[in-house]
């Protein structure tokens, strides 16, 4: 007569995270009396998953009614699978015994592999802004995926980047994995509207990769170019000097006028115009009463952009040809004017 056999027909089972795993097991006999138990792993450290005899196993349901007479199907379903459930599951027949049931025969085991989707990639850029022609690093991270095989690509405005390094951790076997990649990007003056994209492809995503983005507007600083020009005389003793601040980003900018090195007026860029490339232009003017000056006047437009050291541009105003007028103002209010490039 043949002794009871425990049959686990599936060598492996693959389940997506969040779904239900069915682990199949049948016995060839009702003899001996005693429960079936399911374990994850083997040896003394094995984890009890289900015991037909006793206990509470809220995630486990039996496929068939084990109270039914002549039942020899001991298959179970485990709900809400997570990567932590991965492992080899054994269906084990015990023989009723005192004081404890005795292990009688084990099935060959079923390896449960869990397919888990990667988390949405998170792209982060440098802590400080950088200027065009500089190389900056972006990192991309995604976690919690299984199996380990994964593909990561970097793009800048749709163009694939090649200068990046990627690591998948851990190197050995694990219930789930993480990916970390660092890409190097050379900034250009046109990058205010640019995007860096990290794209992750995994078997669980069915060909629809996940993307994480970073806007270079949060990384780039485009310093302004300055031009100071003298406008035609508006009145007999007045000269209009303009300072055109072009192609800067971000908008945070403070402009100071100096007359012969002395501060005349300070103002903050407000009504700016935006260029197609995302940079800004701004213009400030100074109305100089030349009759108040005996000598030539050196006018300086000094700009402090985004907390960086000030840049300036000067203009020499010739006053020798103009008669002097005592006590008159040397500067008039500026009225904002804009120029679009």
């Amino acid at each position: 007569e043949e002794e009871l056999q425990v049959i686990q027909p599936d060598k492996s089972v693959l389940v997506a995270a969040g779904e239900t795993a069915t682990l199949r097991c049948t016995a060839t006999s009702l003899i001996p009396v005693g429960p079936i138990q399911w374990f994850r792993g083997a040896g003394p450290g094995r984890e009890l998953i289900y015991n037909q005899k006793e206990g509470h196993f809220p995630r486990v349901t039996t496929v068939s009614d084990l109270t039914k007479r002549n039942n020899m199907d001991f298959s179970i379903r485990i709900g809400n699978i997570t990567p932590a459930d991965a492992g080899t599951y054994y269906c084990v027949k015990f023989r009723k015994g005192s004081p404890d049931d005795v292990e009688f025969k084990s099935g060959a085991g079923t390896e449960l592999s869990v397919r888990a989707k990667p988390s949405a990639p998170v792209v982060s850029g440098p802590a400080a802004r950088a200027t065009p022609q500089h190389t900056v690093s972006f990192t991309c991270e995604s976690h919690g995926f299984s199996p380990r095989d994964i593909t990561l690509k970097w793009f800048k405005n749709g163009n694939e980047l090649s200068d990046f390094q990627t690591n998948v951790d851990p190197v050995g076997e694990s219930v789930s994995y993480s990916i970390h990649s660092t890409a190097k990007v050379v900034l250009t003056r046109e990058d205010v509207h640019s995007q860096v994209i990290c794209e992750v492809a995994h078997v669980t995503l069915q060909g629809d990769p996940l993307r994480g983005t970073a806007n270079l507007s949060e990384t780039i600083r485009v310093p302004p170019t300055l031009e100071v020009t003298q406008q035609p005389v508006r009145a007999e003793n007045q000269v209009n000097v303009t300072c055109q601040v072009r192609k800067f980003y971000p908008q945070r900018l403070q402009l100071t006028w100096l007359e012969n090195g002395n501060v005349s007026r300070t103002e903050t860029a407000s009504t700016v115009t935006e260029n197609k490339d995302g940079t800004y232009n701004w213009m400030s003017w100074l109305l100089v009463n030349v009759s108040a000056h005996r000598d030539d006047v050196k006018l300086t437009c000094q700009v402090e952009h985004d907390g960086q050291p000030a840049v300036s541009k000067s203009h020499d105003l010739k006053v020798s040809a103009h008669p002097k007028e005592q006590g008159s103002n040397t500067a008039a209010e500026n009225t904002g004017s804009n120029e679009r490039n």
């Epitope: 002794e3 009702l30 003899i31 001996p32 009396v33 005693g34 037909q52 007479r69 009723k96 005192s98």
Partner: antibody
Framework: RQLVESGGGLVQPGGSLRLSCAAS????????ISWVRQAPGKGLEYIGT?????ITYYASWAKGRFTGSKTSSTAYLQMTSLRAEDTAVYYC????????????WGQGTLVTVSS | DIVMTQSPSSLSASVGDRVTITCQAS????????LAWYQQKPGQAPKLLIY???TLATGVPSRFSGSGSGTDFTLTISSLQPEDFATYYC???????????FGQGTKVEIK
């Protein structure tokens, strides 16, 4: 589906008897066969269960004098050193208890131990 | 060995009555549910009614029900029928596979 016992009868004290339990309609290979007896006018008494070769067990009082065996179609109970108090109707039943209860029973065979 | 004590040993009841028979084990039965109930009529073999303390055997009328766990168990016949007059036995299993013991029986007679 039924079990049919045979082999009962009159036996002298100290004698031996072999009871048979033939299954029809199902195989015994995946089932235990248990033996239960009932003395005249008394209650039921569990004797033991015959499973596969190594899985055979008996109530403490029956060990040594009662031994069982089975094929895929017939189970046997060998009884030795019989005593007057062994007089009873002997039943075979399919099952091993717990989740494998005694669901099919034979009609019983009377064993009388008397000189 | 496990000892099963049934009560009452006999009872008289009428058709339509609700009948309750109890069975007490000297120790917890195996798995807290290794308890079956059998019905036996004169000159016949026993018949399985309930197993695993509360599972109704195939073909058994639903007026029979079993309950209990550990050491105390009950067989209830919700509405006694003429064919239910018989002797009822509980069978309890201890932790050892050979430790199976019947109660002494409860005879249900017509009042």
């Amino acid at each position: 589906r039924q079990l049919v016992e045979s082999g009962g009868g009159l036996v002298q004290p100290g004698g031996s008897l072999r009871l048979s339990c033939a299954a029809s309609g199902f195989s015994l290979s995946s089932h235990g066969i248990s033996w239960v007896r009932q003395a005249p006018g008394k209650g039921l008494e569990y004797i033991g269960t015959i499973g596969t070769g190594v899985i055979t067990y008996y109530a403490s009082w029956a060990k040594g004098r009662f031994t069982g065996s089975k094929t895929s179609s017939t189970a046997y109970l060998q009884m030795t050193s019989l005593r007057a108090e062994d007089t009873a109707v002997y039943y075979c039943a399919r099952g091993s208890a717990w989740n494998d209860p005694f669901d099919y029973w034979g009609q019983g065979t009377l064993v009388t131990v008397s000189s | 060995d496990i000892v099963m004590t049934q009560s009452p040993s006999s009872l008289s009841a009428s058709v339509g009555d609700r009948v309750t028979i109890t069975c007490q084990a000297s120790q917890s039965v195996y798995g807290n549910n290794d308890l079956a109930w059998y019905q036996q009529k004169p000159g016949q073999a026993p018949k399985l009614l309930i197993y695993l303390a509360s599972t109704l055997a195939t073909g058994v009328p639903s007026r029979f029900s079993g309950s209990g766990s550990g050491t105390d168990f009950t067989l209830t016949i919700s509405s006694l029928q003429p064919e239910d007059f018989a002797t009822y036995y509980c069978l309890g299993g201890g932790d050892d596979e050979a430790d199976n013991t019947f109660g002494q029986g409860t005879k249900v007679e017509i009042k």
